[in-house]
């Protein structure tokens, strides 16, 4: 039975040319986190394997930095970065937990961070 919940940074916005940290946190489960995948609309951004460390997809190596923690830092943002991002927690023995973050990259200097919310 999957009892865990993922808390994410929720709906966030950032300025074009800036950077943003995408973060998820898995709680309420004793399952072992074996790997976390970060995806952008079915495109792999990065893998963080609990034992083996980070792998950043070649096409994102110049703009994606691992961390902090299991999170991901996106740099040199463009309006094309607007969209859904997913953190996929592979756990044992529970299975897979998915968190969703929506990022809006704004042309203007007014970029407000959204509230946190939980995904069961």
């Amino acid at each position: 039975m999957m009892t865990g919940t993922i808390e994410t940074t929720g709906n966030i916005s950032a300025e074009k040319g800036g950077s943003i940290i995408l973060q998820c946190h898995l709680s309420s489960t004793t399952a072992q986190v074996t790997q976390v995948n970060w995806e952008q609309q079915d495109q792999l951004l990065a893998i963080c394997n609990a034992d083996l460390g980070w792998h950043i997809s070649p096409s994102f190596k110049d703009r994606v930095a691992p961390g902090p923690g299991l999170g991901l830092t996106l740099q040199s943002l463009t309006v094309n970065d607007t969209g859904e991002y997913f953190c996929i927690y592979h756990t044992y023995p529970d299975g897979t937990y998915t968190g969703r973050i929506f990022l809006e990259v704004l042309e203007s200097s007014v970029a407000e961070h959204g509230a946190r919310f939980q995904i069961p």
Epitope: T34, Q35, N37, E39, D42, L44, I47, H55, S57, P58, S59, F86, I88, H90, G95, T96, T98, R100
Partner: nanobody, 122 residues
């Protein structure tokens, strides 16, 4: 859904070698990575090696670095783990795992094989 079948485990003396195979079938068009984990009695499942599909990067746990080698034969949809200079502490059940995209945002994206026992005697 992805199915994984491991083979190649067995009993070997310390200092010996084994090659594990993991054959993947099913929805394997867009696997991100495949890897090997192991679990010794009373211990957590430990990731020991990973190979990625985007650029073939390979990663190893410190405990096996220089002794184990992961490789892939894409034509056969198979991943191998060549294990040399085996030690008694390598004794464990070895599992293959594959990681793919979060299609439909539900279901299992971390497929596990059934495991193969490796026993290293001193």
């Amino acid at each position: 859904e992805v199915q994984l079948v491991e083979s190649g485990g067995g009993l070997v003396q310390a200092g010996g070698s084994l090659r594990l195979s993991c054959a993947a079938s099913g929805n394997i068009d867009r696997l991100y990575a495949m890897g090997w984990f192991r679990q010794a009695p009373g211990k957590e499942r430990e990731g020991i090696s990973l190979i990625t599909s985007d650029d073939g990067s390979t990663y190893y746990a410190d405990s096996v670095k220089g002794r184990f080698t992961i490789s892939a034969d894409n034509a056969k949809n198979t991943v191998y783990l060549q294990m040399n200079s085996l030690k008694p502490e390598d004794t464990a059940v070895y599992y293959c795992a594959s990681s793919g995209p979060a299609d439909a945002r539900n279901g299992e994206r971390w497929a596990w094989g059934q495991g193969t026992q490796v026993t290293v005697s001193s």
